[in-house]
């Protein structure tokens, strides 16, 4: 039994990161490997995590983490019964994926105005909450042509765009990511999509 | 092992207020966040609080906003929940709960709100 | 706040059965879902995290599915120690809430 793929993992940098990895063949990760991580410091304690399968050679690992600092670096065992299959490590603060933000709403009662609202999805004390940014994007159900991306790179959790900028009398659907420049972040995973029928006042033309 | 010890618990009356301590053991407290949580008699899990080992940030559960504090003394390997002005709806047993997501948990003290 | 809704709040089964349990988030939480155990007169102890994980030690009857707002937790082939109270807990946000409870008794 070898590793074909070493691990590579993501932090949300909150609670979880995520470890994933491939075999050389097929593999029930939970039967047959462990993933054991430790925070570098004095006195911590190892921690143990059973795989999960993602495929059938790739395994998957979600490690429980308390609140992530800048500084915490974990040591990663990959145990296949009592043989090492791989050793490495780990600095949650280099690999950030942000969480997905939530929430998700279309407001359409402003005149003329969609208002996207979403929630940040860490709270106050998390270092991300002041530095996501966002991309919002908006598509038409009818017309896969009509597919936009608004990118939000103010911190304030919202989108104002006129409503006339998009087809009147369809329904659209909106989704938002997020992502932080300062640990140069991956993209969160989509929010879930939020659906809307999009219908505004044509301007009364004179002839 | 990691231990955790709550005390402090005991009878009070409506209005009153008491001071819960946990002691840690078996592991380096100071890299760990912390929580209270309690259980009403015969009733299920209510998460009260929580304490950052990172920021020191701190948390309540909507029940107990204003009238309850959660603290912490690393340098005693404690972490305290100061309870005042007490309701009947307070009586439970509390636990503290280690994180990350409540790996480790006390035996818990039992709180007993009435006239 | 997030509202976590369990279901049943009770049940009756037989050693052997397939117990299933259900979690229902008010809001998208993702896979920040956890699931414990508590006997009576016993401090509660973690079986699930992450919504599928399983907590290392615990048996593999357990497993436990779901994203986003449904989550399932499911004991194989019930034990005889599995007699006890099943709590769902989201830590996706503060406050950070637990289900009712699923009393799980010997029929």
């Known amino acids: 039994m070898k590793v074909l793929q070493e691990p590579t993992c993501v932090s949300d940098y909150m609670s979880i990161s995520t470890c994933e990895w491939k075999m050389n063949g097929p593999t029930n990760c939970s039967r047959e490997l462990r993933l054991l991580y430790q925070l570098v410091f004095l006195l911590s304690e190892a921690h143990t995590c059973i795989p999960e399968n993602n495929g059938g050679a790739g395994c998957v690992c979600h490690l429980l983490m308390d609140d992530v600092v800048s500084a915490d670096n974990y040591t990663l065992d990959l145990w296949a019964g009592q043989q090492l299959l791989w050793k490495g490590s780990f600095k949650p603060s280099e690999h950030v994926k942000p969480r997905a933000p939530g929430n998700l709403t279309v407001h359409t009662n402003v005149s003329d105005t969609l208002l996207l609202t979403w929630s940040n999805p860490y709270p106050p004390d998390n270092y991300l909450y002041n530095h996501l940014t966002y991309a919002v994007n908006i598509w038409s159900e009818n017309d896969p042509a009509d597919f936009r991306i608004y990118n939000v790179t103010y911190l304030e959790p919202s989108l104002r765009i006129a409503a006339s900028t998009l087809k009147s009398g369809i329904s659209y659907r909106a989704r938002v990511r997020a992502w932080a420049q300062c640990y140069n972040t991956t993209w969160s995973e989509w929010s879930p999509s939020t659906k809307w029928h999009n219908s505004y006042r044509e301007p009364f033309e004179q002839h | 092992q990691v231990q955790l010890v709550e005390s402090g618990g005991g009878l009070v009356q409506p209005g009153g207020s008491l001071r819960l301590s946990c002691v840690a053991s078996g592991f380096t407290f100071s890299h760990s966040s912390m929580n209270w949580v309690r259980q009403a008699p015969g009733k299920g899990l209510e998460w009260v609080s929580y304490?950052?080992?990172?920021?020191?940030?701190?948390y309540y559960a909507d029940s107990v906003k204003g009238r309850f504090t959660i603290s912490r003394d690393n340098a005693k390997n404690s972490l305290y929940l100061q309870m005042n002005s007490l309701r009947d709806e307070d009586t439970a047993v509390y636990y503290c709960?280690?994180?990350?997501?409540?790996?480790?948990w006390g035996q818990g003290t039992l709180v007993t709100v009435s006239s | 706040d997030i509202q976590m809704t369990q279901s049943p709040s009770a049940m009756s089964a037989s050693v052997g059965d397939r117990v299933t349990i259900t979690c229902r988030a008010s809001q998208d939480i993702s896979n920040y879902l956890a699931w414990f155990q508590q006997k009576p007169g016993k401090v509660p102890t973690r079986l699930i995290y992450a919504a599928s994980s399983l907590q290392s030690g615990v048996p593999s009857r357990f497993s436990g599915s779901g994203s986003g707002t449904e989550f399932t937790l499911t004991i194989s082939s019930l034990q005889p120690e599995d007699f006890a109270t099943y709590y769902c807990l989201q830590w996706s946000s503060y406050p950070r809430t637990f289900g009712q409870g699923t009393k799980v008794e010997i029929k």
């Open positions: 709960a280690r994180e990350p997501v409540f790996d480790y």
């Open positions: 304490i950052s080992r990172a920021t020191g940030a701190v």
